[in-house]
């Protein structure tokens, strides 16, 4: 009893400590650690039935998918997978958890968002944070130097997500990557083409793909006077330019990150520029930037990339944006991010980005991190932010009040009179065996009205009605639910007629 009282006091004290730290705006890491301690204390306390009733809910940052949401999701996945396959990708899968060591040192500041699993008999494990690092591990482990693959799976991040904006702790990523030594910018251009094809097919609104290159960023920081040790942290400040003003970014770089104001101003002259191939040409003439080897390589590759994007017919969707500085540590070359555009309030205003829906880039060093000899396998890829897309599609369908079918049933086997259950069971079985998606109501003697109502609600287009007279005549009454039109179909022709009406191929190939 004393033990429980002590633990209860500790839980109370720890709760106060957490609240205090939040009020003081203590570092996120410290708050996270103290919250984790609080949870461990509570776990030791265990349930006290007299005090607390278990709240039935999904864990923070997760959700269930209803049949309606799943229908949306499957449609989205279908568009994406068809595109990936059209571009000749193979598919792989990897474990949901990896050895902790595999994920360590690959994500920079984001490493603190990795979920560690409680030790299970010796191996220190973590849930995967993305699909790219496991892919690199897969390549290194199998000594592969060449593959074009896609991978659709859930990833896990200990984020504090704004779920209303389609962000979660468990979410799907849809990745497409090309690994191998190829001529410059051809695979990169294809990745951007894929991104544009998918976003256009999904019809979620106008979008823009921002493109930059890690080498240009690094070269620019070098000529502006940023020390190597500050590159990554300054990158993360610059990357905020799509959300906040240059003034705020500059204040962060100078005030919080210790950058000299004149260095920040030099960076500002560059990162506030965006345009097309003409900006690439302009920067190639820049007296300082063109003297930097890294930047020059990056600009040369971008010039080539824009040529290919023009040939692919998507150059109008691409913007060279010097403020794009994607957070992950492993990018080495071209980087890109697709944002949806809000229609401007007034004509003449610049379109406003409403958040990233796809992103990617070149990461030539990641596989080498896993290879004992450090052998590199150049890679480039993209990731579609499907959770964001699900949210947008769901909202759009709700706004349109569109009915979404959650099943694919083509026909309901119904009866007009009593005592026909055996006949319904025989017919539904025949239909299933012929590859028809069919259902029946689980009642011996259902009312015809109830059966028709069920079809209306479930969006089932056809009803196959069995009656005593129809049985004698060897026919089935086939009724269209929407037009209410009925025709007698010979039983042996029923399968073919249903397939014809529902546009299904006549053989199950």
């Amino acid at each position: 009893m004393a033990e429980r009282a002590a633990l209860e006091e500790l839980v109370k004290l720890q709760g106060e400590r957490v609240r205090g730290l939040k009020q003081q705006k203590a570092s996120a890491e410290l708050i996270e650690e103290e919250v984790a301690k609080l949870l461990k204390l509570k776990a030791q306390l265990g349930p006290d039935e007299s005090k607390q009733k278990f709240v039935l809910k999904t864990p923070k940052g997760t959700r269930d998918y209803s049949p309606r949401q799943m229908a949306v999701r499957e449609k989205v996945f279908d568009v994406i997978i068809r595109c990936f396959k059209r571009h000749g990708a193979e598919v792989i899968d990897t474990p949901v958890f990896e050895l902790k060591e595999t994920l360590m040192g690959k994500y920079g500041e984001d490493s603190k968002l990795i979920y560690d699993l409680k030790d299970q008999g010796g191996e220190l494990l973590s849930l995967r944070y993305d699909l790219t690092v496991p892919f690199a591990r897969y390549l290194a482990m199998n000594k592969l130097t060449n593959i074009k693959r896609y991978h659709i799976a859930k990833v896990y991040r200990r984020d504090n997500p704004a779920m209303t904006r389609g962000r979660y702790r468990e979410f799907y990523q849809c990745d497409f990557d090309i690994a191998g030594n190829f001529d410059p910018m051809i695979p990169d251009a294809e990745c951007l083409k894929i991104m544009c094809e998918i976003l256009s097919s999904l019809q979620i609104g106008d979008f823009l793909v921002k493109v930059n290159d890690r080498r240009i960023l690094d070269g620019m920081f070098a000529i502006c006077g940023v020390s190597d040790s500050k590159f990554r942290t300054i990158c993360s400040s610059v990357d905020k330019l799509d959300k906040v003003s240059w003034e705020e970014v500059k204040n962060e770089m100078v005030g919080e990150k210790g950058l000299a104001p004149e260095v920040a101003d030099r960076i500002g002259d560059y990162v506030q520029q965006h345009g097309g191939v003409s900006l690439v040409e302009q920067l190639l003439q820049d007296p300082k930037l063109s003297q930097n080897k890294q930047a020059l390589e990056g600009l040369g590759d971008l010039k080539l990339l824009f040529e290919y994007l023009t040939l692919f017919g998507i150059d109008d969707k691409i913007s060279f944006d010097l403020s794009l500085a994607r957070g992950l540590d492993y990018y080495t070359g071209v980087i890109y991010e697709a944002v949806l555009l809000q229609t401007p309030a007034q004509a003449g205003e610049e379109p406003l980005g409403v958040g990233s829906v796809a992103a990617g880039g070149r990461y030539d060093g990641l596989v080498g991190m896993f290879d004992p000899k450090g052998r590199k396998v150049p890679c480039v890829g993209l990731s579609i932010g499907v959770e964001r897309i699900f949210s947008i599609v769901e909202q759009r369908l709700e706004a349109l009040e569109e009915k979404i079918r959650t099943t694919e049933t083509q026909v309901l086997v119904a009866s007009a009179q009593k005592k026909l259950l055996e006949e319904r069971l025989k017919l539904v079985s025949e239909l299933w065996d012929a590859g028809i998606k069919a259902e029946l109501l689980y009642k011996k003697n259902p009312k015809l009205l109830n059966q028709l109502q069920y079809c209306e609600e479930a969006g089932i287009p056809l009803v196959a009605i069995i009656g005593e007279q129809e049985l004698k005549d060897g026919v089935i009454k086939l009724r269209s639910v929407t037009s209410r039109e009925e025709v007698d179909v010979r039983r042996e022709d029923l399968v073919e007629e249903i397939k014809r009406r529902t546009g299904q191929p006549l053989c199950i190939c």
Partner: antibody
Framework: QVQLVESGGGLVKPGGSLRLSCAAS????????MSWIRQAPGKGLEWVSY????????KYTDSVRGRFTISRDNAKNSLYLQMNSLRAEDTAVYYC?????????????WGQGTLVTVSS | DIQMTQSPSSVSASVGDRVTITCRAS??????LAWFQQKPGKAPKLLIF???NLESGVPSRFSGSGSGTDFTLTISSLQPEDFATYYC?????????FGQGTKLEIK
Amino acid sequence: QVQLVESGGGLVKPGGSLRLSCAASGFTFSDYYMSWIRQAPGKGLEWVSYISDSSRYTKYTDSVRGRFTISRDNAKNSLYLQMNSLRAEDTAVYYCARYLYQVIAIAKSWGQGTLVTVSS
Amino acid sequence: DIQMTQSPSSVSASVGDRVTITCRASQGISSWLAWFQQKPGKAPKLLIFVASNLESGVPSRFSGSGSGTDFTLTISSLQPEDFATYYCQQANSFPYTFGQGTKLEIK
């Protein structure tokens, strides 16, 4: 019963290195935060470093930060302290200690200590 | 860093006496305080945690009180085995710091 046994102490020259180990038994090691606490001869106690149950969090007192590294191997029920660039003022008995109620920074269980002497 | 100051530095007392040792924190630490007993050549032993909770197996003659910045350890009736050095420690924020110790000697 809970047992913590330190090893690895000894005499080392200034600038040298030592690795202390602590073998734990009698409890579920992977559930507990662990720490190293030291006591210079005839002096008080100083909390040197701690490590969380999964190694996600580690902290060091200012005087050792950058020179000492705390680590653990949950599979082996072992805690370690890698001490580099040792100084005369690091001379002390080093205790391995287990947190109270898994996460409370109060040393509930202590080892017998291992003496580290830094001297030329 | 939070400084912990114990008083007195040493105290002489006899078996059966009531002894009080105080500990002051340089800033508020709520109830995040522990008391330890250490005998020569041995590791410290936990007596009291979060200011007033008696560690299991510790005799009830030991008690702790206080919160914020001022704390006390009281031994209601000294026993021969209680002669040792006593330390307080704050567990509020890292670096966790100990008092300089109070040596309890036989009068």
